[in-house]
């Protein structure tokens, strides 16, 4: 039972966690306009990986998508790729963990193939949750870096006349995001590989029999043949507690922004 | 589209006075109010702003401590009131409704407020 | 504070004729995020409210009649009456839109011969 726990508790998580992916990937605040020690300005500035948005006091927002694929720095669009790379594997490792539950009965699905199933799908939600992680992880960088540039050049003008404003970029909501969702993803994926174990079949050791040979006492008893699955064995049917699964993944999305032309 | 201000004041140095602006056409909480000073012959000065939807204000160093608007919805009326009135108070004040790029797209018609003794 | 300075202080011109005044701000008004320019003009008929003309700095209002043209970037902007009527008597002032607190020229007061 433990098994089956462990398994759809692991599924749900990584649910939880593609669909954080999915959140953050089509989200307009990865980067946000840093307001700290800026002259207050009426316009607030945010950028996504497809768009970049300015919101006036007024409240009237407006939003523009990067229509050109060549002029985008290729970080972005690296960044682009495994966001989109980590969504794919989720997705696909996601459908074949449905057909992997125990709790599902497909035909005469053996237990072997859903175990092989389940190590699939657990190693596409590491390699998914890897990819957001990365993703997440090299947008943040890029704006620590262009962070740092653009306040050296605040204080850097001509004659120390600085006459345009330099907007600087910050960290916003969908990195957070992402983060959580990808450790979340990751989290589900081993959850899966453990329930993988416990999922294989269990070593069949076949009864002793004893064969008389005339004038002899001798018994031949056949070695334990393993049902080869590669996962190993110890898989005793146990009771399991089915415990759902409670998250708590509430993350505040703020309304700033970085120059990609 | 409508901002209808009350009418015009004639106070006493050191006291307060509250003037309103009464918007209709448009959906009240949506918008930002915005009030601007004049003085007779003078430019324009802005005081602040309130969101009605929110009552969160923002307000020019200048008139913090002087003015404090306030807005009720059910009445779609906007507030500022003006206290320790002193001659340099005697001015027309604007209310506006804020717009794209944050203008003041609509004004209302103005209300003179006079300090005297 | 965002300093808008207009010039000329007043002009006086005859209907018909085409009329340029000029705003500086301290500070670029121009927001990297939308190319925009926070940069709104006014106009101000005599023991009237202030009336809208251009928003984004170029940007006409509706109902504003297409004689009036407002351009310009960063810091240095224009309001151009391409050809004067007798109902443009007004101050004409310009507003920093985009820096708190908001700051107005001081106007430009258009007479008419």
């Known amino acids: 039972m433990a098994v089956t726990a462990c398994q759809g508790l692991g599924f749900v998580v990584s649910l939880i966690g593609i669909a954080g992916i999915i959140a953050a990937t089509c989200m307009d605040q990865w980067s946000t306009q840093d307001l700290y020690n800026n002259p207050v300005t009426a316009v607030f500035n945010y950028q996504g990986l497809w768009r970049s948005c300015v919101r006036e006091s007024s409240g009237f927002t407006e939003c523009r998508g990067y229509f050109t694929l060549l002029g985008l720095p290729a970080m972005l669009q690296a960044v682009r790729a495994l966001m989109i790379v980590g969504i794919v594997l989720g997705a696909i490792g996601l459908l074949v963990s449905i057909f992997a539950l125990k709790c599902i009965r497909i035909g005469s699905m053996e237990d072997s193939a859903k175990a092989n199933m389940t190590l699939t799908s657990g190693i596409m939600f590491i390699v998914s949750g890897l990819c957001a992680i990365a993703g997440v992880s090299v947008f943040a960088n890029m704006l620590v870096t262009n962070f740092w540039m653009s306040t050296a050049n605040m204080y850097t003008g001509m004659g120390g006349m600085v006459q345009t404003v330099q907007t600087r970029y910050t960290f916003g909501a969908a990195l957070f995001v992402g983060w959580v969702a990808g450790g979340l993803t990751l989290i589900g994926g081993v959850m899966m590989c453990i329930a993988c174990r416990g999922l294989a079949p269990e070593e069949t050791n076949y009864k002793a029999v004893s064969y008389h040979a005339s004038g002899h006492s001798v018994a031949y008893k056949p070695g334990g043949f393993k049902a080869s699955t590669g996962f190993g064995s110890n898989t005793k049917n146990k009771k399991i507690y089915d415990g759902g699964a409670r998250t708590e993944d509430e993350v505040q999305s703020y309304p700033s922004k970085h120059d990609y032309v | 589209v409508q901002l209808q201000e009350s009418g015009a004041e004639l106070v006493r140095p050191g006291t307060s006075v509250k003037v309103s602006c009464k918007a209709s056409?448009?959906?009240?909480?949506?918008?930002?109010i915005e009030w601007v000073k004049q003085r007779p012959g003078q430019g324009l000065e802005w005081i602040g702003m309130?969101?009605?939807?929110?009552?969160?204000?923002n307000y020019n160093e200048k008139f913090k401590g002087k003015a404090t608007l306030t807005a009720d919805k059910s009445s779609s009326t906007a507030y500022m009131q003006l206290s320790s009135l002193t001659s340099d108070d005697s001015a027309v004040y604007f209310c506006?409704?804020?717009?794209?790029?944050?203008?003041?797209?609509?004004w209302g018609q103005g209300t003179l407020v006079t300090v005297s003794a | 504070d965002i300093m808008m300075t207009q010039s000329p202080l007043s002009l006086t011109v005859t209907a018909g004729e085409k009329v340029t005044m000029s705003c500086k701000s301290s500070q670029s008004l121009l927001n990297s995020g939308n190319l925009k320019n926070y940069l709104t003009w006014y106009q101000q008929k005599p023991g009237q409210p202030p009336k809208l003309l251009t928003y984004?700095?170029?940007t006409r209002d509706s109902g504003v009649p297409a004689r009036f043209t407002g351009s310009g970037s960063g810091t240095d902007f224009t309001l151009t009456i391409s050809s004067v009527q007798a109902e443009d008597l007004a101050v004409y002032y310009c507003?920093?839109?985009?820096?708190?607190?908001?700051?107005f020229g001081g106007g430009t007061k258009l007479e008419i011969k």
């Open positions: 506006a409704r804020g717009g794209f790029g944050n203008s003041f797209a609509y």
């Open positions: 507003q920093n839109d985009y820096f708190y607190p908001y700051t």
């Open positions: 984004w700095a170029s």
């Open positions: 056409g448009y959906a009240f909480t949506n918008y930002l």
């Open positions: 309130i969101n009605p939807g929110s009552g969160g204000t």
